[in-house]
C-alpha cells in the first residue's frame, strides 16, 4: 500500500520539497503534539459494563516501543447487580495507527512503516441471534 | 525498506535511539486492512452505548481519512431496548501517530503528529455522590 | 468536592410554568453533563432531562419533550430546567445531577418539592 501523492490539482508542489530518492520519502519522527498532555478519562476501564486490562508490548526495533493494548476482562458483560451476564458479549474495538520499524540487514539499517492494530478497550454488544435447524 | 550503511565498527556502533529523521520505504507494512470501521463491524449500531462515525478528512495528512466516533446516546441502552440515564454512553479515546507532509503539499516528505480521535464508546457505571 | 446549588421550585397551578437552576461548583473538574431526574411518592426514580456538555446535545425523557426545555450557562456550570404546561403527574421531588470526570463519578443534589395543584 503506497502513500497516495498529493492528487488534488490545486496542491502545486512547492520548491522548497526536500529531494527524495526514488521509492521512498523523508521522515521528520519528531512527534508533533509529542509534549501535549490529553485529557483522557481514566479508570473508564474498571467501570466500563465490559471492563478491560492493558498490557504494554515493548520493541526496541519499533518506533514507538511501547504500545498498549486493550484485552477484554470477560466474555459477558456486567449488569445492574455486578454479575457477569453471558447473553451479553464483551468485545474488543480497535484502531489502526502507525509505527516505524527498524530492520537490520548485516551491518545496515533500514526503516519501514507499518500499520498497528491497537485494541483500545471494550464495548457491551447485543448479539445477532440466529436459531439453526 | 531503503537501506543506510552502518559504521565500518557497526556491531559496537550500535544507536539504541532511533535518528530524528529517517528514509522509508513507500509502502506501508501490514496493510490491506479495512479502515473503514463501519465495514469492519456492526459494534456501532449493537452496543449497548453506540456511536456514529464521522468521516474526518485532510489531504496534508496520512492516512487522510480518520472516522470519529460520537456516542449517540448520553446514557446506554438497556434490556427493553430503552435508555438508560443511570448509567453513561462513553468515547473511547485513543492517541494515534498519522502522517502530516511538511513542508505543506510536498508529496514524499512527512513528519510524525500524535492526534487524539474517539474510537467508539463504553457504557460506564459512575461512582455515585450524595452532596449534602 | 463537587457542591450543586439548587433554586426554583414550589407550588404551581396545572398549565403553569417553573423554572429550576443548578450550578455545580467546587475545585477543578470538568463536566460530562448535568440534568434532573425526579421521584413521585411511591415510584421510581425517574429520568426528566439532561445536557452533554462537551458538545450541548439536550436528552428528554418522552413525558416532557416539548414541555420541558433544558439549557446549560458554561460559565456558571449551570443548568436550568424551564417547565410548560405543567400537569398534576409532574408533581414530584426533583433532584439535580452533575457526572464529571468523563461520566465517571456523579454528583446528587439535594431534591426540590415541585408540587402542580389548582
Known amino acids: 500500500r503506497k502513500i497516495p501523492k498529493v492528487g488534488h490539482t490545486f496542491f502545486q508542489k512547492p520548491e522548497s520539497c526536500p529531494p527524495v530518492p526514488g521509492g521512498s520519502m523523508k521522515l521528520d519522527i519528531g512527534i508533533i503534539n509529542e509534549n501535549q498532555r490529553v485529557s483522557m478519562s481514566r479508570n473508564i476501564e474498571s467501570r466500563s459494563t465490559s471492563p478491560w486490562n492493558y498490557t504494554v508490548t515493548w520493541d526496541p526495533n519499533r518506533y514507538p516501543s511501547e504500545v498498549v493494548q486493550a484485552q477484554c476482562r470477560n466474555l459477558g458483560c456486567i449488569n445492574a447487580q455486578g454479575k457477569e451476564d453471558i447473553s451479553m458479549n464483551s468485545v474488543p474495538i480497535q484502531q489502526e495507527t502507525l509505527v516505524v520499524r527498524r530492520k537490520h540487514q548485516g551491518c545496515s539499517v533500514s526503516f519501514q512503516l507499518e500499520k498497528v492494530l491497537v485494541t483500545v478497550g471494550c464495548t457491551c454488544v447485543t448479539p445477532v441471534i440466529h436459531h439453526v435447524q | 525498506g531503503i537501506t543506510i550503511p552502518r559504521n565500518p565498527g557497526c556491531p559496537n556502533s550500535e544507536d539504541k535511539n532511533f535518528p530524528r529523521t529517517v528514509m522509508v520505504n513507500l509502502n506501508i507494512h501490514n496493510r490491506n486492512t479495512n479502515t473503514n470501521p463501519k465495514r469492519s463491524s456492526d459494534y456501532y449500531n449493537r452496543s449497548t452505548s453506540p456511536w456514529n462515525l464521522h468521516r474526518n478528512e485532510d489531504p496534508e495528512r496520512y492516512p487522510s481519512v480518520i472516522w470519529e466516533a460520537k456516542c449517540r446516546h448520553l446514557g446506554c441502552i438497556n434490556a427493553d431496548g430503552n435508555v438508560d440515564y443511570h448509567m453513561n454512553s462513553v468515547p473511547i479515546q485513543q492517541e494515534i501517530l498519522v502522517l502530516r507532509r511538511e513542508p505543506p503539499h510536498c508529496p514524499n516528505s512527512f513528519r510524525l503528529e500524535k492526534i487524539l480521535v474517539s474510537v467508539g464508546c463504553t457504557c460506564v457505571t459512575p461512582i455515585v455522590h450524595h452532596v449534602a | 468536592e463537587v457542591q450543586l446549588v439548587k433554586s426554583g421550585g414550589g407550588l404551581v397551578q396545572p398549565g403553569g410554568s417553573l423554572r429550576l437552576s443548578c450550578a455545580a461548583s467546587?475545585?477543578?473538574?470538568?463536566?460530562?453533563?448535568m440534568g434532573w431526574f425526579r421521584e413521585a411518592p411511591g415510584k421510581e426514580r425517574e429520568f426528566v432531562a439532561a445536557?452533554?456538555?462537551?458538545?450541548?446535545?439536550?436528552y428528554y425523557a418522552d413525558s416532557v419533550k416539548g414541555r420541558f426545555t433544558i439549557s446549560r450557562d458554561n460559565a456558571k456550570n449551570a443548568v436550568h430546567l424551564q417547565s410548560n404546561s405543567l400537569k398534576s403527574e409532574d408533581t414530584a421531588v426533583y433532584y439535580c445531577?452533575?457526572?464529571?470526570?468523563?461520566?465517571?463519578?456523579?454528583?446528587w443534589g439535594q431534591g426540590t418539592q415541585v408540587t402542580v395543584s389548582s
Open positions: 445531577y452533575a457526572d464529571v470526570q468523563g461520566g465517571l463519578h456523579r454528583y
Open positions: 467546587g475545585g477543578t473538574f470538568s463536566l460530562f453533563a
Open positions: 445536557i452533554r456538555w462537551s458538545d450541548g446535545s439536550s
